[in-house]
């Protein structure tokens, strides 16, 4: 049954509408034409479209689609970008504070070790920062370097203050002795364990956030295929050719088209879900020795304890090292005498109380809750885009790609489309190379996150005492495991009050652009009717 002739026998409406898309009227017929050259908007009768108009519609449709996709991901993208920046900055602040605490400990307790100790501490925390940001750094190496560098200074300044300034020649021997004689007990091993565990998790957390940004950016800038462009054109613009300017596509039809166009993108869904759930598991496990904030801000105390351990054993050590490094020394220097009362009985030690006001862990949990609301982001994309573009409600009196229908029938629409375009073919093509690449990256990070995430009842945690020491790290001599702080120690209060230093606000409710219209560029706005405001995120 032939469709009714265009309401406007002169194509006037079509001309004025098309002019907004493309200034100039040379492509628009003045009166309906047979349209035998059309390839997308196949006419059943006279048409107000030309081949050139069709091409312009296809281009516009693809631009519309790209813009809708970007609007859909805006809030999610802003959430992850904002948080990645905030956490990176926060981690740097933690490192800076940990360095300052450690330097203050040296200044207050061992002024004779400065400025050398400041240099070694600086080197250590520089490596910590570099490691977190993904540099090729080995944690054991940086801890070894710290203690290798510290011991010669401790020996020459604290244990043997009679040594001349130019003690570089015995440094070599002292560095060797540090490891051979385990002069710091098991403290270096303890620090290695705590620092490596906490930093590994921190590094992967940041890596995961940055990959999240990459995923969104990839899908945000997808270029849609010509096949998709044809389907979109048929849905959004072919009705114009028949002079049906105000008709909206059927909702069901829009969903079919979007699923076809986004078949590749939707394949990300499975890995995206896994990404958010794995990230949640990682975050849930980031406490005690898996929490860099907790570990790094307590390092000054452990380093202080390690020096006390050396001092406690100064007598034995000086004699042994005197023999061991005799060839490096011109003479034996007197050993410094340390009165017994310098050593605090472990039983009376009180662990410095840490008050948590607002910590990084609460920020992390908040982020996970927000991310979980986007867990269905990719599977819901087709539906979201349809709900944010003009579609007819209840599928009544709507455009099905060929004609105006009273009620949309998917079967009829599919049959009618067979000759024009094979929707099934589009779905079978598989994702674009960029989508495949991002899926591979997601698989990789998910694997890393799973490796890092321990089961809920981690065996390791049961072996940790209150100070977070691993059992087995302390030898028979309990003094190796002094966990408290001597005189002049800093009290670590309001652990992350310094989050206030962050210039960011994590609240994304007023994210820039959240109220923008999901429309094409200004000169194309009117062709798209009213796409509606992007009020809510795609959840």
């Amino acid at each position: 049954q032939p469709p009714p002739p265009p309401p406007d026998a002169t194509c006037h409406q079509v001309r004025s509408f098309f002019q907004r898309l493309q200034p100039g009227l040379k492509w628009v017929p003045e009166t309906p034409v047979p349209g035998s050259d059309l390839q997308v908007c196949l006419p059943k009768g006279p048409t107000c479209c030309s081949r050139k108009m069709e091409e312009k519609y296809q281009l516009t449709a693809r631009l519309n689609m790209e813009q809708l996709l970007q609007s859909a991901s805006m809030e999610l993208k802003f959430l992850i970008i904002q948080n990645a920046a905030v956490f990176q900055e926060a981690f740097e602040i933690v490192v800076r504070h940990a360095k300052n605490y450690t330097n203050a400990m040296f200044k207050n307790n061992y002024p004779s070790l400065t400025p050398q100790a400041f240099e070694f501490v600086g080197e250590f925390f520089t490596d910590v920062s570099l490691y977190i940001l993904g540099s090729d750094i080995n944690v054991d190496d940086m801890v070894n370097e710290l203690f290798d560098s510290l011991f010669p200074v401790i020996y020459t300044q604290l244990m043997n203050p009679g040594l001349p300034d130019s003690a570089l020649d015995i440094n070599e021997c002292l560095r060797g002795a540090r490891r051979d004689l385990k002069v710091f007990g098991n403290f270096p091993k303890l620090i290695m364990t705590q620092v490596s565990k906490s930093l590994q998790v921190t590094r992967i957390f940041l890596q995961a956030l940055n990959l999240g940004i990459e995923v969104i950016n990839t899908t945000d800038h997808l270029k849609f295929s010509k096949d998709c462009g044809r389907m979109l054109t048929r849905m959004w613009y072919c009705s114009y050719c028949q002079g049906l300017m105000m008709v909206k596509p059927c909702g069901g039809y829009c969903n079919v088209v979007m699923q076809g166009c986004m078949a590749g993108v939707v394949e990300i869904d499975k890995y995206w879900r896994e990404y958010i759930l794995s990230l949640e598991e990682l975050v849930n496990g980031m406490y005690r020795i898996y929490d860099m904030e907790n570990v790094l801000l307590g390092l000054f105390s452990t380093i202080h304890d390690s020096i006390q351990y050396v001092q406690k054993n100064a007598g034995k050590l000086t004699t042994t090292i005197g023999k061991l490094c005799a060839h490096s020394q011109q003479r034996q220097y007197r050993s410094a005498y340390y009165p017994e009362d310098l050593f605090i009985d472990k039983k009376v030690l009180k662990v410095a109380h840490v008050e948590h006001e607002e910590t990084l862990s609460s920020r992390r949990r908040e982020l996970i809750q927000k991310l979980k609301s986007f867990i269905s982001f990719y599977s819901a994309l087709p539906g979201y885009i349809c709900s944010h573009s003009p579609v007819a409600e209840n599928d009544t009196l709507c455009w099905n790609g060929q004609e105006l229908v009273e009620r949309y029938s998917q079967k009829a629409a599919r049959n009618g489309m067979k000759n024009q375009f094979n929707l099934h073919e589009l779905k079978m093509k598989g994702p674009e190379p960029v989508v495949s690449q991002i899926i591979d990256k997601l698989k990789h990070i998910n694997q890393l996150l799973r490796t890092m995430s321990m089961p809920k009842g981690r065996v390791l945690d049961k072996n940790l005492d209150e100070e977070g020491f691993e059992s087995g790290d302390c030898g028979d001599d309990e003094d190796e495991c002094i966990g408290g702080s001597g005189d002049g120690m800093i009290k670590v209060k309001n652990q992350l009050r310094f989050l206030a230093e962050l210039a960011y606000d994590l609240d994304v409710d007023d994210a820039p652009g959240n109220s923008q219209q999901a429309t094409p560029k200004d000169n194309e706005i009117s062709t798209f009717h009213n796409l509606g405001n992007v009020h809510s995120p795609l959840k």
Epitope: P115, F118, E119, N138, M142, N144, E145, D148, E172, R175
Partner: antibody
């Protein structure tokens, strides 16, 4: 006595590759971070790269990142610098030095000339 | 361009005291220690002063280093003819995560 001896320098065309070696003796090589520092003709010193004692951590100046690779073989007491995609501006005497932040001992250097 | 600034040249007569300055910023000299090297023509640099003011054994006490704020200086007392060389300062830079050198100062004994 600490000794560092560089080798492997020479003339190479732009885009070419060279591998420098530094043989160390007189100290426990594996206990020390090591660096490469270069000096263009008539110019000052410029740090190029560093590596930790075990070789687990590596560091590079921005000017060579992605082109140069530092490595070490502690069993042979030798430090290496693999230089790829060489440019005219890489022309310099390359010194190996002990340390990462401050350099207490230096080798005599090996000259690398990048020219067509 | 060098991150640390040194005067290109300095000179003095034998027996005189010469001071070389090295000026940086808060991310290098301001927060890390300074080391000084001497490079005789055609030879490798040699460490003169480390940790701002420490001398390795074998370096005469005519050489002394000091640091204040974001500047450091090397003083050579009782200048001798074999002190003619290029002198370099170096400090770690926290922003660049790398050691930075001064451009070098050529000391001439008149």
């Amino acid at each position: 006595e600490v000794q560092l001896l560089e080798s492997g320098g020479g003339l190479v065309q732009p885009g070419g590759s060279l591998r420098l070696s530094c043989a160390a003796s007189g100290f426990t090589f594996s206990s020390y971070a090591m660096s490469w520092v270069r000096q263009a003709p008539g110019k000052g010193l410029e740090w190029v790269s560093a590596i930790s004692g075990s070789g687990g951590s590596t560091y590079y100046a921005d000017s060579v990142k992605g082109r140069f690779t530092i490595s070490r073989d502690n069993s042979k007491n030798t430090l290496y610098l693999q230089m790829n995609s060489l440019r005219a501006e890489d022309t310099a005497v390359y010194y190996c030095a002990r340390g990462k932040r401050y350099f207490d001992y230096w080798g005599q250097g090996t000259m690398v000339t990048v020219s067509s | 361009s060098y991150e640390l600034t040194q005067p290109p040249s300095a000179s003095g007569t034998p027996g005189q005291r010469v001071t070389i300055s090295c000026s940086g910023g808060s991310s290098n000299i301001g927060s890390n220690t300074v080391n000084w090297f001497r490079q005789l023509p055609g030879t490798a640099p040699k460490l003169l002063v480390y940790f701002n003011n420490q001398r390795p054994s074998g370096v005469p006490d005519r050489f002394s280093g000091s640091k204040s704020g974001t500047s450091a200086s090397l003083a050579i007392g009782g200048l001798q003819s074999d002190d003619e060389a290029d002198y370099y300062c170096v400090a770690w830079d926290d922003s660049l995560n790398a050691p930075v050198f001064g451009g070098g100062t050529k000391v001439t004994v008149l």
